[in-house]
Interface confidence: low
């Protein structure tokens, strides 16, 4: 844009410039090319020799301008159209400027301390004749000159007539500036343009309120000689909690948030979260919802999952293995990172579940006890003749540290006894003869405990290598047995199971097999008190 320092057309009153001598330049009323009334200066002393008529403008503050443009609109009479003026008429005039710190007043232009500096000799591209004058064809000339760089606070213009017939229709003085603007959310101040031949003026911008630039690199623009901004470098971005609206940053309204300057617009709060304030940088989770530390602010708030569904188990007693399987929780809490954790409790055979204690390190979990993604697990090394409660908890990224002990679990209670209460090394071979074998074992239920007196034992045996279907069976009410009528020097497989008599007998499993070889006919009996 142009910053006008002087525009003679803008004045309706007299311009009141200084004319010396007084019979030289004369201020008169006229009109511009649009018929608007204006004040002009004219001189036409073409018939008299040695003309030296000066016209000095008032003092012109240069403002921020260093390179100043002077635009002159004038008409000039063709000397050949003026009879008798051939020797004295001129078709040019001179323009000067005089830099000063203050108004010189109305003194003689060349007496101002420093000498006026000539800008140029101005000639008309088109001059008018007497005929044009009669037809009111005033041929307007426009000339623009540049002065500077200026260093003082202001200046006067001076016009020297040396014998022309000239009318100054308009004098306009201005400098070009790049107007104050907001570009890329940065404000740039009005900046005076340099000369057309100089480099661009680099200007640092200031980020608008609630915006920020790249650290250490403010946005910059370059003011060109024509007063246009060029070559923007960098931009500001609305800060977290604010979004761009035209040339400014406005707060995210309630229900919206913006986490980073890198995002252009506020976003609606993710599911199950809210932002009650303006300019929110994140949304707060609703009650009972949370985000995990690894969730981004854009993630929906989630909650711990419900319990696993349809927990089922199968118990095999030879060997003693508890297999569990379950279905995913009905409500995953809105997350995909559901895992499962198992808690094993060993409880008394009777009485409340409160009489339970952790199973301890003896029990093994396959594939693992915690962090399961599988929906199945196996428990090994359970004790026979015990009651176990196994809890399967569903966890996700927002489950608290105590969640596995919380309420989002399913549980089963399983009794492993009284059948097959022994490990293989707990059955003793008390006596081995050619035709008999005596075995003993500890009682699965402590003597005197309820049900202990009712326990019966069933011993199944068969020759090793023979079909298992060809077994023989004996029963006993005590934890010891002697099996007779065996073949000498023959390897037998023995299996024992225990149960209270009744319909549930068939459901019990035999303990792990042990093998015993009867002695040959010549061998004497042996008593072996150590475990087999």
């Amino acid at each position: 844009e142009e910053v006008i320092l002087l525009d003679s057309k803008a004045s309706q009153a007299e311009l009141g410039w200084t004319a010396l001598p007084s019979n030289g330049w004369e201020e008169i009323s006229g009109v511009d090319e649009h018929d608007r009334p204006i004040r002009t200066y004219q001189v036409c002393n073409v018939l008299e020799p040695n003309q030296d008529n000066w016209l000095q403008t008032g003092w012109i503050s240069r403002g921020r301008g260093q390179r100043i443009f002077v635009e002159l609109q004038f008409t000039l009479r063709d000397c050949s159209s003026i009879p008798g003026a051939a020797g004295t008429c001129k078709e040019t005039f001179n323009v000067y400027y005089l830099e000063t710190e203050a108004d010189l007043g109305r003194g003689r232009p060349r007496l101002g301390g420093s000498r006026p500096r000539k800008i140029d000799t101005i000639a008309a591209d088109e001059s008018f004749t007497q005929g044009d004058l009669g037809e009111r064809k005033m041929k307007l000339n426009t000339e623009v000159r540049e002065i500077g760089p200026l260093s003082r606070r202001g200046f006067h213009l001076a016009f020297q007539d040396v014998g022309a017939c000239v009318a100054l229709v308009s004098v306009r003085v201005y400098y070009k500036q790049c107007r104050a603007t907001v570009r890329g959310l940065a404000t740039f101040p009005a900046t005076a343009a340099e000369s057309a031949f100089s480099t661009l003026v680099e200007v640092a911008g200031t980020c608008v309120a609630h915006s920020e630039g790249e650290p250490g690199s403010p946005p910059r623009m370059h003011c060109g000689a024509d007063g246009e901004w060029l070559v923007p470098v960098g931009r500001c971005s609305c800060s977290a909690g604010f979004q761009e609206r035209g040339d400014f940053c406005e707060a995210c309204p309630p229900g919206f948030y913006k986490v980073s300057p890198r995002r252009p617009l506020c976003s609606p709060c993710p599911e199950h979260s809210r932002a009650l304030e303006n300019a929110s940088t994140f949304c707060v989770c609703q009650d009972s919802y949370a985000r995990s530390p690894t969730d981004p602010p854009s993630a929906s708030c989630t909650r711990p999952p419900s319990a696993p569904r349809d927990l089922q188990y199968s118990l095999s007693r030879s060997p003693l293995v508890l297999r569990l399987r379950w279905l995913p929780p009905a409500d995953s809490g809105g997350r995909s990172d559901v895992t499962y954790s198992l808690l094993c409790l060993r409880c008394g055979r009777e009485g409340p579940a409160g009489a339970c204690e952790p199973c301890g390190p003896r029990v093994a979990f396959l594939p693992r006890q915690a962090g399961l993604r599988e929906r199945a697990a196996t428990l090994l090394h359970l004790r026979p003749g015990a009651r176990y409660t196994v809890r399967v908890a569903a966890l996700n990224g927002v489950s608290g540290p105590a969640a596995a002990a919380g309420t989002t679990y399913a549980q089963v209670t399983v009794s492993t006894g009284p059948g097959a209460p022994w490990e293989e090394d707990e059955i003793r071979r008390d006596r081995v003869e050619p035709q008999s074998v005596s075995l003993s074992w500890r009682e699965p239920i402590p003597a005197g405990a309820p049900g202990a007196n009712d326990t019966e034992y069933e011993i199944r045996y068969y020759e090793k290598g023979q079909s298992e279907q060809t077994y023989s069976m004996v029963k006993t009410g005590a934890p010891t047995v002697t099996v007779t009528n065996l073949k000498p020097a023959t390897r037998y497989v023995f299996q024992i199971r225990a149960a209270s008599p009744g319909p549930s007998w068939e459901a019990q499993s035999f303990n792990p097999s042990i093998e015993v070889q009867t002695l040959g006919e010549a061998a004497s009996g042996s008593r072996d008190q150590s475990p087999a």
Partner: antibody, heavy 119, light 112 residues
Framework: QVTLKESGPTLVKPTQTLTLTCTFS??????????VGWIRQPPGKALEWLAH???????RYNPALKSRLTITKDTSKNQVVLTMTNMDPVDTATYYC???????????WGQGTLVTVSS | DIVMTQTPLSLSVTPGQPASISCRSS???????????LNWYLQKPGQSPQLLIY???NRFSGVPDRFSGSGSGTDFTLKISRVEAEDVGVYYC?????????FGQGTKLEIK
């Protein structure tokens, strides 16, 4: 498919208040960058922008008419309502609602509704 | 307010021939992001306006490639490389840089 439809009275008396409803589908005013505006066109004349409302309830009005205009939205109903008070016969025009999106600007228009102001 | 001036106001073109419409704004339409929010619309007889070009030169989806836009600052042009019968109607430019948004007065395109 984006569609907008204007509804409201076809005839109002001078000094009365005009209430127009824009019902839209194919987009949501809860989506960042979306807006809905009102534009009118007197018979045989050019278009004149009246008001706009964006997803975050920011509103802009034509300064020449601002004292007479109110624009509101109901995101759940996919509706935008424009009220214009103190109607005059010179307000006779076809009133259009139109969607604004980022970056295209005013991109989809309703079919328009002709409102005649006459006693 | 920004004044949008379209020229010519009417245009009669033979099918297959090119057409050009000018739109001039009273101030620069480049905003602080460096974007120029100048759109072109066609209003066919009895219909609502439809977007042809947005941001000076971007064709909207479904707009034939015979339509193109150009310009910067304050001077903008819509060109139709080969006019077809279906192109008749009134063409409007719209600036969305400054509030109030303002339209040009329209250019009526007819087929010879």
């Amino acid at each position: 498919q984006v569609t907008l439809k204007e509804s409201g009275p076809t005839l109002v008396k001078p000094t009365q208040t005009l209430t127009l409803t824009c019902t839209f589908s194919g987009f949501s005013l809860s989506t960042s960058g979306m807006g809905v505006g009102w534009i009118r066109q007197p018979p045989g004349k050019a278009l004149e922008w009246l008001a706009h409302i964006w997803w975050d309830d920011v509103k802009r009005y034509n300064p020449a008419l601002k004292s007479r205009l109110t624009i509101t939205k109901d995101t759940s109903k996919n509706q935008v309502v424009l009220t214009m008070t103190n109607m005059d016969p010179v307000d006779t025009a076809t009133y259009y609602c139109a969607r604004t999106s980022f970056p295209a600007g005013v991109d989809y228009w309703g079919q328009g509704t002709l409102v005649t102001v006459s006693s | 307010d920004i004044v949008m001036t379209q020229t010519p106001l009417s245009l009669s073109v033979t099918p297959g021939q090119p057409a050009s419409i000018s739109c001039r704004s009273s101030q620069s339409l480049q905003n602080s992001n460096g974007n120029t929010r100048l759109n072109w619309y066609l209003q066919k007889p009895g219909q609502s306006p439809q977007l042809l070009i947005y941001r000076v030169s971007n064709r909207f989806s479904g707009v034939p490639d015979r339509f193109s836009g150009s310009g910067s600052g304050t001077d903008f042009t819509l060109k139709i490389s080969r006019v077809e019968a279906e192109d008749v109607g009134v063409y409007y430019c719209l600036q969305e840089t400054h509030v109030p948004f303002t339209f040009g007065q329209g250019t009526k395109l007819e087929i010879k």
